[in-house]
Amino acid sequence: ASNFDCCLGYTDRILHPKFIVGFTRQLANEGCDINAIIFHTKKKLSVCANPKQTWVKYIVRLLSKKVKNM
């Protein structure tokens, strides 16, 4: 659900963190319409997710902790 590198909506699936290698934050006040977390998967896919959903926050936290501990 993205266009010109902007997410236009969110996935309705819950992604398992084992498939996710990183993420990018999309901010609505920086040229896109909505706030989003863009998850980057092992298969080189980009998935737009709702930053308010708990599963999304949880994965962002897990990935952030990994980066901090590297």
Epitope: I14, H16, P17, N50, K52, Q53, T54, W55, K57, Y58, R61, L62, S64, K65, K68
Partner: antibody, heavy 121, light 111 residues
Framework: QVQLQQSGAEVKKAGSSVKVSCKAS????????ISWVRQAPGHGLEWVGG????????DYAQNFTDRVTISADKATKTVYMELHSLRSDDTAVYFC??????????????WGRGTLVTVSS | QSVLTQPPSASGTPGQRVTISCSGS????????VNWYQQLPGTAPKLLIY???QRPSGVPDRFSGSKSGTSASLAISGLQSEDEADYYC????????????FGGGTKLTVL
């Protein structure tokens, strides 16, 4: 209606470990996060850690990272919290609480009744 | 020391309106929604307000929540004796300390 049933009160010696359980009934286990929140006598609430069972990856508050292990058994819909190297200030009621992970809020909408853990020196 | 700051106590007489404040920072209340819990003596906490101002079914509309910047507040109008309880605010925290942070709690006394 979902309920969270917790194991009974425990009395432990300082330096030992305790394992508390929280069993979910009445709903699927796939869209939950289960957190553990503790309350020392006369004090406020403190988040200890949590797990999303379908991810099978636990997360812990910084204060507890070295001493707590949270795990889930999807077959029995039970989440466990094990606290090691117990100290007298770990004496508290330990609550489990549910969050629905697909909603756009992170509230604990259902709570267990609590398990009193008493640590004696 | 709790991450979110609440007054330790509040009081009011039946029928009055009482407000409880909750102050945080940009990493918690400033960038996430606030939830409020009511804890009656000797019982588990109960969800009272979620997503700043939403009431779960069964919670009377006497209870309302609001958020502005890095602060939030819980208002109770038409105070009743059964409202005597401890009230806790909570929010997700984007720092790596712990994702869920609570206020220290406010003991509400109905005079």
């Amino acid at each position: 209606q979902v309920q969270l049933q917790q194991s009974g009160a425990e009395v432990k010696k300082a330096g030992s470990s305790v394992k508390v359980s929280c069993k979910a009934s009445g709903d699927t286990f796939s869209n939950f996060a289960i957190s553990w929140v503790r309350q020392a006598p006369g004090h406020g609430l403190e988040w200890v850690g949590g797990i999303i069972p379908v991810f099978n990856t636990a997360d812990y508050a910084q204060n507890f990272t070295d001493r707590v292990t949270i795990s889930a058994d999807k077959a029995t819909k039970t989440v466990y919290m094990e606290l090691h190297s117990l100290r007298s200030d770990d004496t508290a009621v330990y609550f489990c609480a549910r969050t629905k992970i697909e909603l756009d809020n992170d509230a604990f909408d259902i709570w267990g009744r609590g398990t009193l853990v008493t640590v004696s020196s | 020391q709790s991450v979110l700051t609440q007054p330790p106590s509040a009081s009011g007489t039946p029928g009055q309106r009482v407000t409880i404040s909750c102050s945080g920072s940009s990493s918690n209340i400033g960038s996430n929604t606030v939830n409020w819990y009511q804890q009656l003596p000797g019982t588990a906490p109960k969800l009272l307000i979620y997503s700043n101002n939403q009431r779960p079914s069964g919670v009377p509309d006497r209870f309302s929540g609001s958020k502005s910047g890095t602060s939030a507040s819980l208002a109770i109008s038409g105070l009743q004796s059964e409202d005597e309880a401890d009230y806790y605010c909570a929010a997700w925290d984007d720092s790596l300390n712990g994702p869920v942070v609570f206020g220290g709690g406010t003991k509400l006394t109905v005079l």
